[in-house]
């Protein structure tokens, strides 16, 4: 025997208390598939969330974050505060990257500078809070007889000393 509710399209629910007729989803709710017995509640984009896409009877609202925040989690389930480049977000707010680390984005954590010597290379440009070091040719490449290389510019001051 065919389920009479299977005829109810997306945007409706099968209303058993009204002889299984297909009733439209109530305001602020949706059903994205047919045959549903109850419509789902639309997501509300409140506070630091803002509406990227309005809810319709067949699809949920989509949220993003207000300026100064960015999305985290599936479907932007959380908004996290932005920091400046050269900082990371801690429980106490945005903090500068410690010496030897950098962050070139407004989100995420400070990461250690690349260790050029692990690849047998030299430091071409020193790192800062905002930028990783730039590795240059290996010291062997700079030995007499090797093809000429423009000597690196004087190293900039390291970006940040420990506080």
């Amino acid at each position: 025997l065919q389920d009479p509710c299977s005829n109810c399209p997306a945007g409706t629910f099968c209303d058993n208390n009204r002889n299984q007729i297909c009733s439209p989803c109530p305001p602020n709710s949706f059903s994205s598939a047919g045959g549903q017995r109850t419509c789902d509640i639309c997501r509300q984009c409140k506070g630091v969330f803002r509406t990227r896409k309005e809810c319709s009877s067949t699809s949920n609202a989509e949220c993003d974050c207000t300026p100064g925040f960015h999305c985290l989690g599936a479907g932007c389930s959380m908004c996290e505060q932005d920091c400046k480049q050269g900082q990371e977000l801690t429980k106490k707010g945005c903090k500068d990257c410690c010496f030897g680390t950098f962050n070139d984005q407004k989100r995420g954590i400070c990461r250690p500078w690349t260790n050029c010597s692990l690849d047998g290379k030299s430091v071409l440009v020193n790192g800062t809070k905002e930028r990783d070091v730039v590795c240059g040719p290996s010291p062997a490449d700079l030995s007499p007889g090797a093809s000429s290389v423009t000597p690196p510019a004087p190293a900039r001051e390291p970006g940040h000393s420990p506080q």
Epitope: N16, N28, T38, I41
Partner: antibody
């Protein structure tokens, strides 16, 4: 027979977590939302949230958003609620209840007593 | 959130008499209101939904009325099994769905 069968009473320590279950019989599990409702001793009813077993979509009462996690296991027609960071305020009877149509509750489990005590 | 207020807190009625229970919403909930009965040690049971529609198997002595903010549950002739706590619940618009604090109907 159409019913919701809930897990047995739980005695848990403060700070711990507990996961209680609600097994559906006699109807197609994915057709109906499963809601969870809290009732403190001698108190009224407090709606926690629901899960739609069809698509795992959840909606919460904001005050329980960080307290309760709702999941389902479709093949066994079972819904679960995990409560974390338990305190004495979480000692209560927890009911699962089915929704049909608009969001009233036409079928209830018998309740699971959760007692938080050291 | 919408606050539901029930009155009276306790209603003392003799068997066979009429009982009238009131539920008021802090803002309009249209007709999106349900009534439940709860006996000691038991789960609530749906009596009325959409303000006035009796749920399956509920006797005709139970009736509901009202819309907007003011609602009434009437038990026309109280039977011994009707002595219990009654809750109203709104399910209008946005969650959280909220319940009244309950009215206890006791034997006079």
């Amino acid at each position: 027979q159409v019913q919701l069968q809930q897990s047995e009473a739980e005695l848990v320590r403060p700070g711990a977590s507990v996961k209680i279950s609600c097994k559906a019989f006699g109807y197609t599990f994915t057709n109906h939302h499963i809601n969870w409702v809290k009732q403190r001793p001698g108190q009224g009813l407090d709606w926690i949230g629901y899960i739609n077993p069809y698509n795992d979509y959840t909606t919460f009462n904001r005050k329980f958003k960080d307290k309760a996690t709702l999941t389902v296991h479709k093949s066994s027609s079972t819904a679960y609620m995990e409560l974390s960071g338990l305190t004495s305020d979480d000692s209560a009877v927890y009911y699962c209840a089915r929704t049909w149509g608009h969001w009233y509750f036409d079928l209830w489990g018998r309740g699971t007593v959760v007692t938080v005590s050291s | 959130e919408i606050v539901m207020t029930q009155s009276p807190a306790t209603l003392s009625v003799s068997p066979g008499e009429r009982a009238t229970l009131s539920c008021r919403a802090s803002q309009s909930v249209s007709s999106n209101l349900a009534w439940y009965q709860q006996k000691p040690g038991q789960a609530p049971r749906l009596l009325i939904y959409d303000s006035s529609t009796r749920a399956t198997g509920i006797p005709a002595r139970f009736s509901g009325s009202g819309s907007g903010t003011d609602f009434t549950l009437t038990i026309s002739s109280l039977q011994s099994e009707d002595f219990a706590v009654y809750y109203c619940q709104q399910y209008n618009n946005w969650p959280p769905w909220t319940f009244g604090q309950g009215t206890k109907v006791e034997i006079k």
